[in-house]
Amino acid sequence: EPPTACREKQYLINSQCCSLCQPGQKLVSDCTEFTETECLPCSESEFLDTWNRETRCHQHKYCDPNLGLRVQQKGTSETDTICTCEEGLHCMSESCESCVPHRSCLPGFGVKQIATGVSDTICEPCPVGFFSNVSSAFEKCRPWTSCETKDLVVQQAGTNKTDVVCGPQDRQR
């Protein structure tokens, strides 16, 4: 039996199964009982990424430097431009419409994962035996100094923000 619905990459209009326009092209005119669908390529600054019946192509995304953005991948007639953030910044959202500076890890916290153009710094509290005395977007928690290996003794215990203070051993006379 003849189909009541059109096949893949087709659409039904005026009792005709018309071919969709391929990615990178927009619809100029629907097919008719005697003519095929007419499509035209998108212009340089535009794209369509699916088989479609759109009469207008989508504008490529603009990577606004004033928002900290730069082009990661130039758009084609079939793909949108991909933006990423300038060094030291990361995307505010998944759509990456603007950028914010990477977060620094406060004293007592170290960097677990360094930020990228799309993800912020991930901090972790310094566990016992480690410390961070700076606010940094790069520094990990550092281990306390080992006084013993220096033939010294702990004079002041370390914390998550400070290193231990070593001193000479008391000589019994």
Epitope: E33, T35, T37
Partner: antibody, heavy 119, light 108 residues
Framework: EVQLLESGGGLVQPGGSLRLSCAAS????????MNWVRQAPGKGLEWVSG????????YYADSVKGRFTISRDNSKNTLYLQMNSLRAEDTAVYYC????????????WGQGTLVTVSS | EIVLTQSPGTLSLSPGERATLSCRAS???????LAWYQQKPGQAPRLLIY???SRATGIPDRFSGSGSGTDFTLTISRLEPEDFAVYYC?????????FGQGTKVEIK
């Protein structure tokens, strides 16, 4: 059952005129585009003309443009082909044919009517 | 206009054999708007395949169509006695629609 019955063929002199008719039944005539296709004796098929379901648009082969006129009367379920300025090379069996549902192909054909152009 | 060239002109085969008919277009046939018809002597043509690969109603599955762009093929997997006839391809990409000159499949 779909039926297409052509009539109006016959012998005509070069330069003469003839009007072919195609009576349709067994389907909703006004929903379908229709066509005329011809076949010269011992030769292949040649698409002659087509008309949209509503009659709004008409199409012709270059060989008949300006001489032949396709038309339809949806109230009478009939397709026509007015042929003027006939030439010897128009001698052929003329078939009317309907479009298949949804697509541009011809699924039902009449048995044809013979047009002979000769002096 | 789009010119369709069919090959071979004549195909001599025995029942049970496979038949492969070719149809080549002078320019790309948009979106595979190509049909195949069978015609026997004294009869009107019969639609076999449309949009290059869709079988028309009531057509046995030994008939199959393939191809796109400028090259199309009609295959009859096992010839039955009733399949010996003339086969035409036809494009309906844009008017004027055109037919190939036909391929005659005859009994060897």
């Amino acid at each position: 059952e779909v039926q297409l019955l052509e009539s109006g063929g016959g012998l005509v002199q070069p330069g003469g005129s003839l009007r072919l008719s195609c009576a349709a039944s067994g389907f909703t005539f006004s929903d379908y585009a229709m066509n005329w296709v011809r076949q010269a004796p011992g030769k292949g098929l040649e698409w002659v003309s087509g008309i949209k379901s509503g009659g709004s648009s008409k199409y012709y082969a270059d060989s008949v443009k300006g001489r032949f006129t396709i038309s339809r009367d949806n109230s009478k379920n009939t397709l026509y082909l007015q042929m003027n300025s006939l030439r010897a090379e128009d001698t052929a069996v003329y078939y009317c044919a309907k479009h298949v549902d949804f697509y541009r192909a011809l699924d039902y054909w009449g048995q044809g009517t013979l047009v002979t152009v000769s002096s | 206009e789009i010119v369709l060239t069919q090959s071979p002109g004549t195909l001599s085969l025995s029942p049970g054999e496979r038949a492969t008919l070719s149809c080549r277009a002078s320019q790309s046939v948009k979106n595979s708007s190509l049909a195949w018809y069978q015609q026997k002597p004294g009869q009107a043509p019969r639609l076999l395949i449309y949009t290059a690969s869709s079988r028309a109603t009531g057509i046995p599955d030994r008939f199959s169509g393939s191809g796109s762009g400028t090259d199309f093929t009609l295959t009859i997997s096992r010839l039955e006695p009733e399949d010996f006839a003339v086969y035409y391809c036809q494009q309906s990409s844009a008017p004027p629609w055109t037919f190939g000159q036909g391929t005659k499949v005859e009994i060897k």
